[in-house]
Amino acid sequence: QPPPPPPDATCHQVRSFFQRLQPGLKWVPETPVPGSDLQVCLPKGPTCCSRKMEEKYQLTARLNMEQLLQSASMELKFLIIQNAAVFQEAFEIVVRHAKNYTNAMFKNNYPSLTPQAFEFVGEFFTDVSLYILGSDINVDDMVNELFDSLFPVIYTQLMNPGLPDSALDINECLRGARRDLKVFGNFPKLIMTQVSKSLQVTRIFLQALNLGIEVINTTDHLKFSKDCGRMLTRMWYCSYCQGLMMVKPCGGYCNVVMQGCMAGVVEIDKYWREYILSLEELVNGMYRIYDMENVLLGLFSTIHDSIQYVQKNAGKLTTTIGKLCAHSQQRQYRSAYYPEDLFIDKKVLKVAHVEHEETLSSRRRELIQKLKSFISFYSALPGYICSHSPVAENDTLCWNGQELVERYSQKAARNGMKNQFNLHELKMKGPEPVVSQIIDKLKHINQLLRTMSMPKGRVLDKNLDEEGFESGDCGDDEDECIGGSGDGMIKVKNQLRFLAELAYDLDVDDAPGNSQQATPKDNEISTFHNLGNVHSPLK
């Protein structure tokens, strides 16, 4: 191997470089010194470094490492945060639409039920929003409360419109009768099943994305050990002590050092992989009654069907309720007659067809594809970080921590490192407490994701059929069916096709393609910066 070049006779270059790190030159020797007090950059001969300089280099190395780690996770963090924000907003828009559709149904078909119905519908959808964001609300209670509130209004406004004000204290009795007599048939149960399934999945999906952000933040802000700081200092700065300012660390050596520094973090890898695969399973199952977009936007139809069910059984119901709630009523009033034209006019309630290709489900799948390109993120982290720091190409004429070498040899470097501190010891320390905590959280969310992953086949549909409902023949390739049973069924082409409101948010005109070339393909970047369309505009 070549002898090291003679050290800078005046330490001039080292002085000028060090001044950029630490204004003032009091720590820098004017000429090379023996350096017997050095603990990290152990000199083979005279050196331009002092103990104080070494300490400054160690601090700088650790700060560098923090920024490199943040750089390595930059795109992954952007990907998850932006998608979490988009989905949260999109879910809120779906809830708003669902509320508006339901209110429109009441306004168009049962104007006498408004404004009370609007109030109950509003409360229901507020609870839906809160539930998605993690609030401790029971979905069955929400649905029961909606129907419990609606029935007295339906009874007094539609079934017994002549009821005097004095008889209006029967509300509590009517609320109770609603459940006892199953006045809405099995519709409340159908809605409970659909809403609870779809909202549970939506909620866990958002929770999982937020935990993904927390995982990256945890590793992003790790504080590195003193041992790691010393290894980094040797790799990045000890060459300067010999006046070798332009020399870069060997790539292989960088990988060894980073594996040592990142040993604890890499332990996340197994659980991170499982997280992405479990999330993929969840997303693959988010269709039909597990898709809140599909379920909530069809609620108006199912609620309408449930009111029709009450109307069809009005005669029988009025008699029974008359007896049941007699103590609250002075006398029995005749049931209202329902002309045929009171039933829903399908033409009136046409859902606007929005010309957007992208649905929430396609966006979810797109996110999973992008996340899968980061499935090896933690195991590849040492390599990522080395790719973000200056290293010598091809491992030729590079710094191996002790000297300038023509070619890097891992064995020699390891031996050299053992002279100062044990790399194996560094690896054996185990993960930091914060890393252990985040691993526990990942285990927990993975378990939740697995239990939430949808049953394959049509198991759930069968259960619904047994309750006396048609599950409908909505094949995967057909338009999605929205709504519960025959009469109220309205087909909405691909739901809202990812919601018109978000269109302006996504900078439609900023689509990649409005450029002088197609979206760039850059193989070097795709190993880490996977240039996915993190927040792709509507196509």
């Epitope: 943040q70 924000a85 988009v86 952000i213 900078d507 970047i525 927040h535």
Partner: antibody, heavy 120, light 107 residues
Framework: EVQLQQSGPELVKPGPSLKISCKAS????????MTWVKQSHGKNLEWIGL????????TYNQKFKGKATLTVDKSSSTAYMELLSLTSEDSAVYYC?????????????WGQGTSVTVSS | DIVMTQSQKFMSTSVGDRVSITCKAS??????VAWYQQKPGQSPKALIY???NRHTGVPDRFTGSGSGTDFTLTISNVQSEDLADYFC?????????FGGGTKLEIK
């Protein structure tokens, strides 16, 4: 149309702190990170840091850690930068700039800038 | 930190000419380079992202090229309104860093 409206010019004495604001409109505020940039002497641009409005997550240039604090108010779609321990070195024009929705866009829309002069 | 060097502080050109502004990175930044134009008294405006892709509304006389450490912004058929400072930015590594700027003057 995406717009970033920054607070007006500031002439302040050296001392504790100053907070400047950047109100966003025309896009979904929580979705795009907001970055802050310092321009001194009419030329030199320095990246201060960025914040994700969705969850308040921040990344700083080490040089500005302890000098700048980034925050957001989602309800008013406003990003803030507080400059601490002001000295004449902090005299500059400060820009907020939105990081594009599509990851590699970098900073695609900029505010008009807030001129800060620190002088005793 | 990655240093972005724009060696030409000033460039003089005439209307209709073609001019190339260069930016050199101190280490490989792949394609994560953007270009900004700043006219006197205004805030910077995004021109190019990811080395060679034009932002919305940017005239096609602006083109970007390069990879690794050497990047170029070319303005063909220079117009008088192109009088401005031009900055490059790398976002491969934190902290993101800008070049020192090149002032384009029209003769």
């Amino acid at each position: 149309e995406v717009q970033l409206q920054q607070s007006g010019p500031e002439l302040v004495k050296p001392g504790p702190s100053l907070k400047i604001s950047c109100k966003a409109s025309g896009y979904s505020f929580t979705v795009s990170p907001m970055t802050w940039v310092k321009q001194s002497h009419g030329k030199n641009l320095e990246w201060i840091g960025l914040i994700h409005p969705y969850n308040g997550d921040t990344t700083y240039n080490q040089k500005f850690k302890g000098k700048a604090t980034l925050t957001v108010d989602k309800s008013s779609s406003t990003a803030y930068m507080e400059l601490l321990s002001l000295t004449s070195e902090d005299s500059a024009v400060y820009y907020c700039a939105r990081w594009g929705n599509y990851y590699p866009y970098a900073m695609d829309y900029w505010g008009q800038g807030t001129s800060v002069t620190v002088s005793s | 930190d990655i240093v972005m060097t724009q060696s030409q502080k000033f460039m003089s050109t005439s209307v209709g000419d073609r001019v190339s502004i260069t930016c050199k990175a101190s280490q490989n930044v792949r394609s994560t380079v953007a270009w900004y134009q700043q006219k006197p008294g205004q805030s910077p405006k995004a021109l190019i992202y990811l080395t060679s892709n034009r932002h919305t509304g940017v005239p096609d006389r602006f083109t970007g090229s390069g990879s690794g450490t050497d990047f170029t912004l070319t303005i063909s058929n220079v117009q008088s309104e192109d009088l401005a400072d031009y900055f490059c930015l790398q976002h491969w590594n934190y902290p993101y860093t800008f070049g020192g700027g090149t002032k384009l003057e029209i003769k």
